[in-house]
């Protein structure tokens, strides 16, 4: 969470940004809020990126002005025009690229003053893991798969019954490059599992952490997955 202040005359404009992460190949949002001016025609929103000449996006007089937009963002940006009235200056970024990572500035000008705040935008790939019982293995095994990760993550297994146990000796993890030659498919197999136990497959890089849980009993298999972005405000 980053709060920036600006001053014009004696009026401060508070602009708030949230560090966020983009999943490459998908659409992302760079979050920015401010106290909205009721005079919408007086609101100017500018998004800038460190090291880039020209603007990422500009919105003024109630509409986009892309005359100074840098070519790397052409056709990929939009503000939530109907939400500017409630102080949402967030930027929608289509088809996130690895090169979109960096420091962005959300700059706001209203009829009373101006202000800005920076945000750190990380890019990578992250996805939910799915755990299945691997019936092809010679012994009872669990197979944890996640289709897209970048940078290469670490993978660890845990179990509810054997808390604190080190499963690195009884697991095998591989990373398979996907067709676009950036992201990788993560596959980890855990051997010698026992029934009536809950196992967790944890995948983590510097952008995200994902966990897949599986509970295997005589009568059923229960699964749960969750994904958490790291260092997000």
């Amino acid at each position: 969470l980053i709060i920036g202040f600006g001053i014009s005359g004696k009026h401060f404009i508070t602009v708030t940004t949230f560090t966020s992460a983009g999943n490459i190949g998908e659409d992302g949002t760079l979050s920015c809020t401010f106290e909205p001016d009721i005079k919408l025609n007086g609101i100017v929103i500018q998004w800038l990126k460190e090291g880039i000449k020209g603007l990422v996006h500009e919105f003024k007089e109630g509409k986009d002005d892309l005359s100074q937009q840098h070519e790397m963002f052409r056709g990929r940006t939009a503000v939530f025009a109907d939400q500017v009235v409630v102080g949402n200056a967030s930027l929608r970024l289509k088809n996130v690229q690895l090169t979109d990572a960096g420091t962005y500035t959300c700059y706001i000008r209203t009829s009373k003053g101006k202000g800005n705040a920076n945000l750190e935008y990380k890019t990578g790939a992250f996805s939910m893991p799915e755990i299945n019982v691997d019936y092809n293995a010679s012994s009872e095994s669990l197979r944890c798969e996640a289709p897209r990760w970048f940078p290469q993550p670490t993978v660890a297994w845990a179990s509810q019954v054997d808390q604190g146990a080190n499963f690195s000796e009884v697991s095998n993890t591989s990373f398979e490059l996907n067709s676009e030659n950036v992201t990788m498919k993560v596959v980890s197999v855990l051997y010698n599992v026992t029934i009536n136990n809950t196992y967790s497959c944890m995948i983590e890089n510097d952008i995200a952490k994902a966990t897949g849980d599986i509970k295997v009993t005589d009568s059923e298999v229960k699964r749960r997955s969750q994904l958490q972005l790291l260092n997000s405000g």
Epitope: H11, E35, P36, D37, I38, K39, L40, N41, G42, E61, G62, K63, A81, D82, Q83, V85, V86, G87, T110, S111, K112
Partner: antibody, heavy 116, light 107 residues
Framework: EVQLLESGGGLVQPGGSLRLSCAAS????????MHWVRQAPGKGLEWVAS????????YYADSVKGRFTISRDNSKNTLYLQMNSLRAEDTAVYYC?????????WGQGTTVTVSS | DIQMTQSPSSLSASVGDRVTITCRAS??????LNWYQQKPGKAPKLLIY???NLQSGVPSRFSGSGSGTDFTLTISSLQPEDFATYYC?????????FGQGTKLEIK
């Protein structure tokens, strides 16, 4: 339930004063701008005043500028309209409304009658 | 000030009819236009915000279109509960201004 409830209306003589209140409930009042809108008997809607979430921006219609004051107390979830030097043409139902993408929540209105 | 002009001022229609109400701004207001419905003795109700977005809970027979200076509210198939007065409102700048209203009556 999201709700706005106006109070403070009544009969007042020309030149007199009234203070209208609007009590908000069911939402985070401090996150929203607010409006006062009025409607004279048999007439259309007329915007009166607006205040932003933290009172940083305040605007008035020319017809009430210098006579009416909009304010809010976020700790009490309440919006106010102080009306001084009232005139016959201020007679109307006064509504408070939440400023979102449109005036999306309205109170039931309170009637102000200015007459001698 | 931005003037908002609605037409027609009144309109008679039957249940099941398709009805269109227009609103014209005296200068460009981008897409910052809302539509409200008001029934006698009641507070207005937001139908459409930002020219074309249906407010939550509003039936899909209501739709809005337009940008710049010319806007339209359409009711695809009138229902008995739709007979009311409709207002457009610009929120591009202050003073916020409403149209004079369109009274929709049963034929």
């Amino acid at each position: 339930e999201v709700q706005l409830l106006e109070s403070g209306g009544g009969l007042v003589q020309p030149g007199g004063s009234l203070r209208l209140s609007c009590a908000a409930s069911g939402f985070t009042f401090s996150s929203y701008g607010m409006h006062w809108v009025r409607q004279a008997p048999g007439k259309g809607l007329e915007w009166v005043a607006s205040i932003s979430s933290s009172s940083g921006y305040i605007y008035y219609a020319d017809s009430v500028k210098g006579r009416f004051t909009i304010s809010r107390d976020n700790s009490k979830n309440t919006l106010y309209l102080q009306m001084n030097s009232l005139r016959a043409e201020d007679t109307a139902v006064y509504y408070c409304a939440r400023a979102s993408s449109g005036m999306d929540v309205w109170g039931q209105g309170t009637t102000v009658t200015v007459s001698s | 000030d931005i003037q908002m002009t609605q037409s027609p001022s009144s309109l008679s229609a039957s249940v099941g009819d398709r009805v269109t109400i227009t609103c014209r701004a005296s200068q460009s207001i981008s897409s910052y236009l809302n539509w409200y419905q008001q029934k006698p003795g009641k507070a207005p109700k937001l139908l459409i915000y930002a020219a074309s977005n249906l407010q939550s809970g509003v039936p899909s027979r209501f739709s809005g279109s337009g940008s710049g200076t010319d806007f339209t509210l359409t009711i695809s198939s009138l229902q008995p509960e739709d007979f009311a007065t409709y207002y457009c409102q610009q929120y591009y700048t202050t003073p916020l201004t409403f149209g004079q209203g369109t009274k929709l009556e049963i034929k």
